[in-house]
Interface confidence: low
């Protein structure tokens, strides 16, 4: 007869490992007992369990509650066992020794490989600000056995670098993603992708990029100067900018205090019916935690009567 087993049995951490050992004997042969032992190099053999044809399963105290026979129906020539809830420490060489009658003893070895799926973690880098050079956006670390693969999935242009640290039973891989921050990256996803033979599918952790910036400020509302005449109602100036974090706005007048009746509403400066006292230089100050910007405009409120008077003069002069 002969023993049938596997060279390597691979399980994921926490799964049950079936250690196969089947005696394919001639007609009339019987299996008296099957002894399982762990036989790592240089450490001798340690009994795991013994399946006895008469007395049943005996389990070593070190493996109490963790070694079982496969569920019935069972073939009397099948000496396979289940090692419950495999852990990293179970990884190694195992030997199955079958005592048969009348053919004698047979033995075979297999290697148990325990895959430890990684538990990836993503750590954002320092705050990103427009104008910085190459900056760490995020690092992603995954530890497992064997070493996991760590890559990045993103539309953002950047560079990656990886390093790995070997531990006694696992390896930790860290990949860093560096980029040159720009405002166009705001809200863009940066996804760490971890691959490993112990995972049914890649694990993905997504980090949303936040880049601090503040755009140049400009003021809208003076496009048609002729609209800024005495008596006009609803005149307003609007300050235009954008930023991350969203900026706050402040209005001042360069040549004095804001005239009475002028309303400040965030980015908008609202005027009451215009008078000449509304003429002046107005400054919009935009700021966020990243930076600040100013934009100033000159308001010149026209007096239609003055204009028409000049026109009459011009006509009479001709």
């Amino acid at each position: 007869g002969e023993l049938e087993t596997s060279d390597v049995v691979t399980v994921v951490l926490g799964q049950d490992a079936k250690l196969p050992c089947f005696y394919r004997g001639d007609s009339g042969e019987q299996v008296g007992q099957v002894a399982w032992a762990r036989v790592d190099a240089g450490e001798g053999a340690q009994e795991l369990a013994l399946l006895h044809s008469k007395y049943g399963l005996h389990v070593s105290p070190a493996y109490e509650g963790r070694v079982e026979q496969p569920p019935p129906p069972r073939n009397p020539l099948d000496g396979s066992v289940l090692l419950r809830n495999a852990v990293q420490a179970d990884e190694g060489e195992y030997e199955c020794r079958v005592s048969t009658f009348p053919a004698g003893s047979f033995q075979a070895r297999l290697r148990l490989r325990v895959l430890v799926p990684p538990l990836p973690s993503l750590n954002p880098g320092p705050a990103l600000e427009e104008g910085q050079g190459l900056t760490l956006a995020a690092s992603c670390t995954a530890e497992g056995s064997p070493a996991p693969s760590v890559t990045w999935d993103t539309e953002v242009k950047g560079t990656t670098s990886s390093r790995s640290f070997k531990h006694s039973r696992s390896a930790a891989v860290t990949s860093e993603f560096h980029l040159v921050p720009s405002r166009s990256m705001n809200g863009q996803p940066l996804t760490c992708v971890v691959s490993h033979p112990g995972l049914l599918q890649d694990q993905r952790i997504t980090h949303i990029l936040h880049v601090s910036f503040l755009a140049e400020a400009s003021v809208r509302g003076l496009e048609d100067q002729n609209l800024w005449h005495i008596g006009r109602e609803g005149a307003m100036l609007k300050c235009l900018s954008e930023g991350q974090p969203p900026p706050s706005y402040n209005w001042t007048r360069l040549d004095g205090p804001l005239p009475s009746g002028v309303r400040v509403d965030g980015d908008t400066l609202g005027f009451p019916p215009l008078t000449t006292e509304h003429s002046g230089i107005y400054v919009c100050h935009v700021s966020n935690e990243f930076s600040s910007r100013d934009s100033q405009v000159t308001v010149d409120v026209l007096d239609p009567q003055e204009d028409s008077g000049k026109q009459v003069d011009l006509v009479s002069a001709s």
Epitope: R38, Q46, S60, P61, A62, Y63, E64, R66, V87, Q88, A89, D90, L119, S121, T141, E143, F165, H167, S168, R169, S170, A172
Partner: nanobody, 118 residues
Amino acid sequence: EVQLVESGGGLVQPGGSLRLSCAASRSTFSLNIMGWYRQAPGKQREYVATITTGGSTNYADSVRGRFTISRDNSKNTLYLQMNSLRAEDTAVYYCTAELVRRGPTTYWGRGTLVTVSS
């Protein structure tokens, strides 16, 4: 045999902080994974966090970002820093450790009570 003794539990207001400790009776270098579980009154024991000898950590979603697990192998001690505590964090917190040897064995402490209440 490894004895695990937790300490640091007590009464704390919502939003407050506590630091739990777990002292092991033998070198924690041989304990490949140490961690914390908790059991609220009338509920099943639930996973909180674990840490490997190399310092890699994992957290339950319910505590990620609020709790931090750490270990000092030179002092044979495991820690759990708990910030921004909520009423639902009230539970008995148990320390656990897995011994690296041929037949892996998991050890448990007796637990320490954390009560979050105003």
